[in-house]
């Protein structure tokens, strides 16, 4: 059964910036992922980003960069403006549509304990997974 | 304008073949999924047969498995579905879709549809 | 398979009423519920996608509500062109099913 794994960290250097990682782990060629913060894109979350492999990606605040890691698999890096940071208890969720099979998401957040300086970079394993 | 204009349909005998072929105008037919949807006569709406952009993923209805084929050609822009071993059941209204992955793969553009008799 | 049950089968409606349709989901399908218009004679046409965003130019009157297993259709006022059978449709989770469609008839 495909699974969507996700991995927010926070940045070591900045700790105002965020990137989260999601990756799908299944057969089938991906068509587009959709990243929500606050829960899922049409459940009350808010789209952050779309990435399609071939028409390329739209963002929206406070959405710095989306890009491909690989091909079944994506980055978001993300600037809170603010004095506090409000992602470090956010859920943010994705979600792999793959044509004809259909769309895998998951929801995940920063861990609670993290220490920024020790971060690790994501793995294709189910980090965090919590499929809706 | 996007158009798909199906045709092949016709009346057929049972365990017969039909070839149907939807030719697409008006948008970069090699860029999009496309898919057969039939109409039963009891307006049923059933997805028969799909295929990626890649024309690599493709989807086949558990019952004409092994019995169709979709295919593309993107040189004519046309989408066909050969049909075999045709089965009284698969008497319907065949339409010809596009899919919008911004959509949510929902069919954004149909075809007017081809109709497909199978006659003992 | 996930099944799309929709209710009612039949309506009949007076133009300038206001119309419910209800699609529920055997499992949930996210966000990803399409519906669609099938005019006496014509080809079924795009109506909302995404559950509540509306295909170009669809008038807004026509609006669509939902996520996970219960979606609504809403046409705020009816008008007679609105004679049709409606259609759900899921595309979350392959193989992709359709409601059984309500038809719409006009007093």
């Known amino acids: 059964t495909p699974e969507v794994w996700v991995q927010v960290q926070m940045e070591a250097t900045e700790l105002s910036s965020f990137t989260v990682h999601c990756g799908f782990l299944g057969p089938g060629s991906i068509s587009l992922v959709t990243v929500s913060w606050g829960g899922p894109d049409g459940a009350g979350g808010t789209k952050l980003a779309v990435l399609h492999p071939e028409l390329g990606t739209r963002q929206w605040a406070p959405a710095r960069q989306a890009r491909w890691e690989t091909q079944s698999s994506i980055s978001l890096a993300l600037e809170d403006s603010g004095a506090s940071s409000p992602f470090a208890n956010t859920t943010f969720c994705c979600k792999f549509a793959s044509f004809p099979e259909g769309s895998w998401e998951s929801c995940g957040s920063l861990p609670p304990s993290s220490d920024p300086g020790l971060s690790a970079p994501p793995t294709p394993v189910p980090i965090l997974r919590a499929d809706l | 304008d996007v158009q798909l204009v199906e045709s092949g349909g016709g009346l057929v005998k049972l365990g017969g073949s039909l070839k149907l072929s939807c030719v697409a105008s008006g948008f970069t037919f090699s860029s999009y999924h496309m898919s057969w949807i039939r109409q039963t006569p009891e307006k049923r709406l059933e997805l028969v047969a799909a295929i990626n952009s890649n024309d690599i993923n493709t989807y086949y209805l558990d019952t004409v498995k092994g019995r169709f084929t979709i295919s593309r050609d993107i040189a004519k822009n046309t989408l066909h579905l050969q049909m075999s071993s045709l089965k009284s059941e698969d008497t319907a209204l065949y339409y010809c879709a596009r899919h919008e992955d911004y959509y949510g793969f929902a069919m954004d553009y149909w075809g007017q549809g081809t109709s497909v008799t199978v006659s003992s | 398979s996930i099944v799309m049950t929709q209710t009612p089968k039949f309506l009949l409606v007076s133009a300038g009423d206001r119309v419910t349709i209800t699609c529920k989901a055997s499992?949930?399908?996210?966000?990803?519920v399409a519906w669609y218009q099938e005019k006496p004679g014509q080809s079924p046409k795009l109506l909302m996608y995404?559950?509540?965003h509306r295909f170009t130019g669809v008038p807004d009157r026509f609006t669509g509500s939902g996520y996970g297993t219960d979606f609504t259709f809403t046409i705020n006022t009816v008008q007679a062109e609105d004679l049709a059978v409606y259609f759900c449709?899921?595309?979350?989770?392959?193989?992709?099913?359709f409601g059984g469609g309500t038809k719409l008839e006009i007093k």
């Open positions: 449709h899921q595309a979350y989770r392959s193989p992709w099913t």
């Open positions: 995404y559950v509540s």
């Open positions: 499992q949930s399908v996210s966000n990803d």
